[in-house]
């Protein structure tokens, strides 16, 4: 953690990825783009899918890949969870096929952690209308994160992604 420069987060400058619940990122992204301008150009090509409305999570998912969340305390970008990816893929892959294209390899769901936990940090997304949330009664903003287990005080509720994320400064098992 000696290199301050290494952990610096940058404001998200991509309009379609603003107001999604986090506002800073760190390049390179999960596809390897070094510049937000390259990520933005690629992101905007997905407009037809977003407009089609195949999944309410699609925009958040794409943004979490192309401009992943950054925190000053952890040296790696926080992208989407595999579960959100699979949910989006299930809804949007048939539509993409209608457009004549296959699901992109860069969005291969096996590349993302299955779920957000102590070993892998990821964003589980804002919850899809037709897909039940994993909790029988969803945690409301401001509630404590008891569902994550014994170390619930190490987590904080993130409104946009509707799930508990490890607070800055706690070891997520990323370096073990």
């Amino acid at each position: 953690f000696g290199d301050e420069e290494e952990r610096r987060c940058d404001p998200i400058r991509i309009s379609m990825c603003q107001n999604l619940g986090y506002n800073v990122t760190k390049m390179p992204n999960l596809v390897g783009h070094e510049l937000q301008t390259d990520a933005e150009l690629q992101l905007t090509t997905f407009t037809p899918l977003i407009q089609y409305g195949c999944s309410s999570q699609l925009q958040f998912f794409l943004c979490s890949v192309y401009v992943p969340m950054c925190t000053e305390k952890i040296n790696i970008p926080i992208g989407p969870c595999g579960g959100m990816c699979l949910s989006v893929k299930r809804r949007c892959e048939p539509v993409l096929k209608e457009f004549g294209f296959a699901w992109p390899e860069s969005l291969n769901c096996s590349k993302f952690p299955p779920q957000n936990d102590h070993n892998h940090m990821c964003m589980e997304g804002p919850g899809d209308e037709e897909v039940p949330l994993p909790h029988k009664t969803p945690i409301q903003p401001g509630e404590e994160c008891h569902s994550v287990g014994t170390n619930s005080d190490q987590y904080i509720w993130v409104k946009r992604s509707l799930n508990c994320v490890l607070k800055c400064g706690y070891d997520a098992g990323l370096y073990s």
């Epitope: 690629q42 090509t45 407009t47 296959a102 992109p104």
Partner: antibody, heavy 118, light 107 residues
Framework: EVQLVESGGGLVKPGGSLRLSCAAS????????MTWVRQAPGKGLEWISY????????NYADSVKGRFTISRDDSKNTLYLQMNSLKTEDTAVYYC???????????WGQGTLVTVSS | DIQMTQSPSSLSASVGDRVTITCRAS??????LAWYQQKPGKAPKLLIY???NLLGGVPSRFSGSGSGTDFTLTISSLQPEDFATYYC?????????FGQGTKVEIK
């Protein structure tokens, strides 16, 4: 059938202006990103400009930046390329193309020839 | 800018031949690569996208492979209608750039 038809090409003097049009049909034009690509006589392909489906994002190759402007009128299903301060090296066939998710160009229009000469 | 280098620049082949065209990117582009076919006086047509995905309606004798910096377009058994110029293109980083083209001629 998805179709793109360019028009507006012709002979123009160096320093002059021209506006190319690309009429789209057979698909929901308003949600797709679009692009312009050119090909000088006997040469390869050069990408020159891009516009997102909502017109909120545009991008240009350095060779045309500041001189060319891409725009669209979704009510007319038409893409435009306004070309100012034309140079002899802008002589080319200009193609418009639809951009699919991921950045792939499909289909392309038949092209329109722009000749810049004194 | 990312430079795309195709080889060979041209090749002569006979109907039924297996033809391979390579495309090298000056830096990694993941699988953000497309292949286009262009016949004289006509617009280019998309054949393969995302390095290895065949566009619907394109004959299965065409195939693409590669990731990162090295990519290949293969025509397993050349047909008379395949004589054309082929271009690779990267859409990973702006400006989006094309290779210089490979002309496939009749031997």
């Amino acid at each position: 059938e998805v179709q793109l038809v360019e028009s507006g090409g012709g002979l123009v003097k160096p320093g002059g202006s021209l506006r190319l049009s690309c009429a789209a049909s057979g698909f929901n034009f308003g949600i797709y990103s679009m692009t312009w690509v050119r090909q000088a006589p006997g040469k390869g392909l050069e990408w020159i400009s891009y516009i997102s489906g909502d017109s909120g994002y545009t991008n240009y190759a350095d060779s045309v930046k500041g001189r060319f402007t891409i725009s669209r009128d979704d009510s007319k299903n038409t893409l435009y390329l306004q070309m100012n301060s034309l140079k002899t090296e802008d002589t080319a066939v200009y193609y418009c193309a639809r951009v699919g998710p991921g950045g792939w160009f499909d289909p392309w229009g038949q092209g329109t020839l722009v000749t810049v000469s004194s | 800018d990312i430079q795309m280098t195709q080889s060979p620049s041209s090749l002569s082949a006979s109907v039924g031949d297996r033809v391979t065209i390579t495309c090298r990117a000056s830096q990694g582009i993941s699988s953000y690569l497309a292949w286009y076919q262009q016949k004289p006086g006509k617009a280019p047509k998309l054949l393969i996208y995302a390095a290895s995905n065949l566009l619907g309606g394109v004959p299965s004798r065409f195939s693409g492979s590669g990731s990162g910096t090295d990519f290949t377009l293969t025509i397993s058994s050349l047909q008379p209608e395949d004589f054309a110029t082929y271009y690779c293109q990267q859409t990973y980083s702006t400006p989006w750039t094309f290779g210089q083209g490979t002309k496939v001629e009749i031997k």
